[in-house]
Interface confidence: low
């Protein structure tokens, strides 16, 4: 229903306190640079002329849309040609344009210093001086280094961080209470960001159709019990949600949230026996809870998918009539038997359910063309599954950081064009799967494993998109979004590749390597290891571990040594020659 | 199957000497770095020395720097802990290990171990 004021109807809905927090997390996605006082200072005069709509919603320009509100406050920004270059321009376009081009400047890898953390004593301080000022830098700070991050849970990740502030500052042993909750928050956000990031890709990228197929078969999953039609109004609320909030309509995303997490709550009986705890919580943990939900139970006695969707004679005329609607009750169907199955596996048998019946039903005798089709789904099931069991294997004997190793040389020899820190980063967020997943049962390891992996592979594709360097990460990104970790498992070695350059800079360690943290360490050495490939792509594995051998044993040698830096240089030195020796470089 | 024998343990006296070898069989013996760990009765078991794969590298614990010394022959799969100085808290049994990364220090990261051999040195 249209209201008269857009942004009086989102501050009354929302409050002032999440309309605030909201704008904040909006202005600080779009203009990652700006600092924390700026945006802090516009959020103050939209909040300020909001309240003016909601004391009169007749007023002057309260009328206008959020977007034009918005946008026309961030192209107040003074600075925005010489920070933001040609996003500038930008403010020369009318809405909806304008909008879409903030949009397409969000960047997923900005050029902004890592987030250090202060001693437990300092930030205990600036809490209590400030509390609201504190938790709003939390926001903003989150916000501009994640400008996708689904930001209704943003104000839920808040407010454990505020609960744990409040509790742990005045704690005996402040820094063993608080540390352990802002390690776990921090791991829970990157992982938040990455699963919002997907889906805004799938809309994005593949549109609201792929969209809603992979919401059809996640939540059919998870709500076996619910009928068709209760599993397709809530894959229909929950596709406006996530296109709200990728869109940077954040004040309406969060309000629709909300709305959808009532709805759920007052229909529970017809949706999931497994509702009940989340629905008596708070408006933002229930909001949490639901997204988290296990799957509930499957009814008993489910019938064959062959009788409604092979063998009956009018599977054709069914599809013919409408054929996504046809399709999403088979994907239904389908999922709700299947919690075992990864939902890009869903969909990969969906999709050639659906090429079936393309070709067949156009062919002479479509019963018999189309008769076989769940044959062909034996070799799709059975490639995911013989792929978890080889790595689950793999990490099990080799732990999680030399199974991260392995992936890095797999990977660096797939597409070595790809920047160095990214395929650190992805390699090792790709071997996380291992401590992830490979400890569940049989039933749950694929739809943990791959479901995982599309994620992490996404944040490749997103990180390559901004500078793109192989076409084979491009293939694999753009043809199929759910055939995309299917597309990376097929690469080989790149035979085009030509070697990197040799450069000892590179090989170059100093004594600042000592007083990393283990995590951080890691790094280095993966970073190395994915240099020595690109330097020597053919290398094998045992002369790739020897040479990471050494490399250990140098670092551990210097650091124990009394004059470090002398250390690093002269062993250094001695390292590179005989990693060349053994690399045959 | 993978096989890391002990030998050359004993009692001997303190400052007296002593040669630990570990022959290994059933895997690529030049592509392991190898260690020595040792554990005496209701105690931890800890790491002495390691070698990494090419020899290039060693580790040595406080305890035993100047007075053990380790080497390895890849070409007889065999590596040795040259024991001089010894002192009764050296009493221990010493396990030889491998390991496929050069480890640093903590025993998971060992791959292969040995049964032990004794090491008593008392007078």
């Known amino acids: 229903d249209a209201h008269k004021s857009e942004v009086a109807h989102r501050f009354k809905d929302l409050g002032e306190e999440n309309f605030k927090a909201l704008v904040l997390i909006a202005f600080a996605q779009y203009l990652q640079q700006c600092p924390f006082e700026d945006h802090v200072k516009l959020v103050n005069e939209v909040t300020e002329f909001a309240k003016t709509c909601v004391a009169d919603e007749s007023a002057e320009n309260c009328d206008k849309s959020l977007h034009t509100l918005f946008g026309d406050k961030l192209c107040t920004v003074a600075t925005l040609r010489e920070t933001y270059g040609e996003m500038a321009d930008c403010c020369a376009k009318q809405e909806p344009e304008r909008n879409e081009c903030f949009l397409q400047h969000k960047d997923d890898n900005p050029n902004l210093p890592r987030l250090v953390r202060p001693e437990v004593d300092v930030m205990c301080t600036a809490f209590h001086d400030n509390e609201e000022t504190f938790l709003k830098k939390y926001l903003y700070e989150i916000a501009r280094r994640h400008p996708y991050f689904y930001a209704p849970e943003l104000l839920f990740f808040a407010k454990r961080y505020k609960a744990a502030f409040t509790e742990c500052c005045q704690a005996a042993d402040k820094a063993a209470c608080l540390l352990p909750k802002l390690d776990e928050l921090r791991d829970e956000g990157k992982a938040s960001s990455a699963k919002q990031r997907l889906k805004c890709a799938s809309l994005q990228k593949f549109g609201e159709r792929a969209f809603k197929a992979w919401a059809v078969a996640r939540l059919s999953q998870r709500f076996p019990k619910a009928e068709f039609a209760e599993v397709s109004k809530l894959v229909t609320d929950l596709t406006k949600v996530h296109t709200e909030c990728c869109h940077g309509d954040l004040l309406e995303c969060a309000d629709d949230r909300a709305d959808l997490a009532k709805y759920i709550c007052e229909n529970q009986d017809s949706i999931s026996s497994k509702l009940k705890e989340c629905c008596e919580k708070p408006l933002l943990e229930k909001s949490h809870c639901i997204a988290e939900v296990e799957n509930d139970e499957m009814p008993a006695d489910l019938p064959s998918l062959a009788a409604d969707f092979v063998e009956s004679k009018d599977v054709c005329k069914n599809y013919a009539e409408a054929k996504d609607v046809f399709l999403g009750m088979f994907l239904y169907e389908y999922a709700r038997r299947h919690p075992d199955y990864s939902v890009v596996l869903l969909l990969r048998l969906a999709k050639t359910y659906e090429t079936t019946l393309e070709k067949c039903c156009a062919a002479a005798d479509p019963h018999e063309c189309y008769a076989k089709v769940f044959d062909e789904f034996k070799p799709l099931v059975e490639e995911p599954q013989n792929l978890i069991k080889q790595n689950c294997e793999l990490f099990e004997q080799l732990g999680e950081y030399k199974f991260q190793n392995a992936l890095l040389v797999r990977y660096t020899k797939k597409v070595p064009q790809v920047s160095t820190p990214t395929l650190v980063e992805v390699s090792r967020n790709l071997g996380k799967v291992g401590s992830k997943c490979c400890k569940h049962p049989e039933a749950k390891r694929m739809p943990c494993a791959e479901d995982y992996l599309s994620v992490v592979l996404n944040q490749l594709c997103v990180l390559h998109e901004k500078t793109p360097v192989s076409d084979r990460v491009t293939k694999c990104c753009t043809e199929s979004l759910v055939n995309r970790r299917p597309c990376f498992s097929a690469l080989e070695v790149d035979e085009t590749y030509v070697p990197k350059e040799f450069n000892a800079e590179t090989f170059t360690f100093h004594a600042d390597i000592c007083t990393l943290s283990e995590k951080e360490r890691q790094i280095k050495k993966q970073t190395a290891l994915v240099e020595l490939v690109k330097h020597k792509p053919k290398a094998t594995k045992e002369q790739l571990k020897a040479v990471m051998d050494d490399f250990a044993a140098f670092v551990e040698k210097c650091c124990k040594a009394d004059d470090k830096e002398t250390c690093f240089a002269e062993e250094g030195k001695k390292l590179v020659a005989a990693s060349q020796a053994a690399l045959g470089l | 199957d993978v096989q890391l024998v002990e030998s050359g343990g004993g009692v001997v006296q303190p400052g007296g000497s002593l040669r630990l070898s570990c022959a290994a069989s059933g895997l690529t013996f030049s592509s392991y770095a190898m260690g020595w760990f040792r554990q005496a009765p209701g105690k931890e078991r800890e790491r002495v020395v390691s070698?990494?794969?090419?020899?290039?590298?060693?580790y040595y614990a406080d305890s035993v720097k100047g007075r053990f010394t380790i080497s390895r022959d890849n070409s007889e799969n065999t590596v040795y802990l040259q024991m001089n100085s010894l002192r009764p808290e050296d009493t221990a049994t010493y396990y030889c290990a491998a390991a496929r990364y050069w480890a640093t220090g903590s025993e998971y990261e060992f791959d292969y171990w040995g049964q032990g051999t004794l090491v008593t040195v008392s007078s």
């Open positions: 070698i990494s794969r090419g020899g290039g590298y060693t």
